[in-house]
């Protein structure tokens, strides 16, 4: 089946938006007014993964770019990166595991757990303009809760 995708933006629980920071990094900061146009639009694809009644496997690409969020080990630590892919082959229903996140909805907030590294989540810092990263704790100082805004 052709992979089903939707376009959306994400904001963390502090209402920080996600923007590009260089060619292969995202950062989170508060945006207002016209600056909101800077935020990245994701193409969220619904893919095969270890789906459960509580978790929906998705891949997060950047709209109109051949870049996907992926999770890899760097210096023995699970790390979030933006990875370039061949646009002829992506998105696809059967994404490699490093591209897959388990979308978890709790109290109208979303978490994105790495399929490759269970219990590691897309995270932002409390501080402004810091990189979006893969964090191994939830409920601590770092933010793992997001809201999603649909984009037509």
């Amino acid at each position: 089946a052709p992979v089903r995708s939707l376009h959306c933006t994400l904001r963390d629980a502090q209402l920080k938006s996600l923007v590009m920071s260089g060619p292969y990094e995202l950062k989170a900061l508060h945006l207002q007014g016209q600056d909101l146009e800077q935020q990245v639009v994701f193409s969220m694809s619904f893919v095969q993964g270890e789906e459960s009644n509580d978790k929906i496997p998705v891949a997060l690409g950047l709209k109109a770019k051949n870049l996907y969020l992926s999770c890899v080990l760097k210096d023995d630590k699970p790390t979030l990166q933006l990875e370039s892919v061949d646009p002829k082959n992506y998105p696809k229903k059967k994404m490699e595991k490093r591209f897959v996140f388990n979308k978890i909805e709790i109290n109208n907030k979303l978490e994105f757990e790495s399929a490759q590294f269970p219990n590691w989540y897309i995270s932002t810092s409390q501080a402004e303009s810091m990189p979006v990263f893969l964090g191994g704790t939830r409920g601590g100082q770092d933010i793992t809760d997001f809201t999603m805004q649909f984009v037509s």
Epitope: A1, Q48, E50, S52, K55, K94
Partner: antibody, heavy 122, light 107 residues
């Protein structure tokens, strides 16, 4: 060699809870998911639900409110509990190993146990 | 949920015959289609995965084809041990769903 073996009582009274165990060998429950499937006498196959290596579960909607699938990885056992059973739950119950080949063949089931017949009757 | 419509529900054939069973999905499932053989009192055995890939140890007289919504399972020359019930299974998305089965009987 991959093997799965179902066990449990062959007779359960209506309104009680059906409890089955699937004991596996030849693979680790932390690496592979296990599904449960049932087959009423003389009828076709119905997929019940599964538990992944992570412990996350997916339950088929018609049974979701009555179903619990859990596992003990150290004992290589997966358990199925189905509450408030009726005669319609009489079936041969199978457990089966998920293929778990990411980006290739994640959801199919490649090895099955021999099945155990559970009859719901008073 | 994806519905799988399998036909025929039963089939009489003789040793040496060529036999074809079809399975139709209610929506596009790419090649995520499996074929199982079940003999009386036994568990189903996976013969073909991903629509056309023969599992190790399965005789080459069994074959599968198709993609999208329409799939075919063929036994090129029936052997006595092939008389059984055959099921298709879609493994595209949850819940996994089976066809109703095809009982292959000796004519």
């Amino acid at each position: 060699e991959v093997q799965l073996q179902e066990s449990g009582p062959g007779l359960v009274k209506p309104s009680e809870t059906l409890s089955l165990t699937c004991t596996v060998s030849g693979f680790s429950l932390s690496d592979y998911g296990v599904s449960w499937i049932r087959q009423p006498p003389g009828k076709g196959l119905e997929w019940i639900g599964l538990i992944w290596g992570s412990g996350d579960t997916y339950y088929n909607s018609p049974l979701k409110s009555r179903l619990t699938i859990s596992k003990d990885t150290s004992k290589s056992q997966v358990s199925l509990k189905l509450s408030s059973v009726t005669a319609a739950d009489t079936a041969v119950y199978y457990c089966a190993k998920q293929t778990n080949l990411w980006a290739y063949d994640l959801y199919s089931m490649d090895y099955w146990g021999q099945g155990t017949l559970v009859t719901v009757s008073s | 949920d994806i519905q799988m419509t399998q036909s025929p529900s039963s089939l009489s054939a003789s040793v040496g015959d060529r036999v074809t069973i079809t399975c139709q999905a209610s929506q596009d499932i790419d090649d995520d289609l499996n074929w199982y053989q079940q003999k009386p009192g036994k568990a189903p055995k996976l013969l073909i995965s991903l629509a056309s890939i023969l599992r190790p140890g399965v005789p080459s007289r069994f074959s599968g084809s198709g993609s999208g919504t329409d799939f075919t399972f063929t036994i090129s020359s029936l052997q006595p041990e092939d008389f059984a019930t055959y099921y298709c299974l879609q493994s595209d998305s949850f819940p996994l769903t089976f066809g109703q089965g095809t009982k292959l009987e000796i004519k």
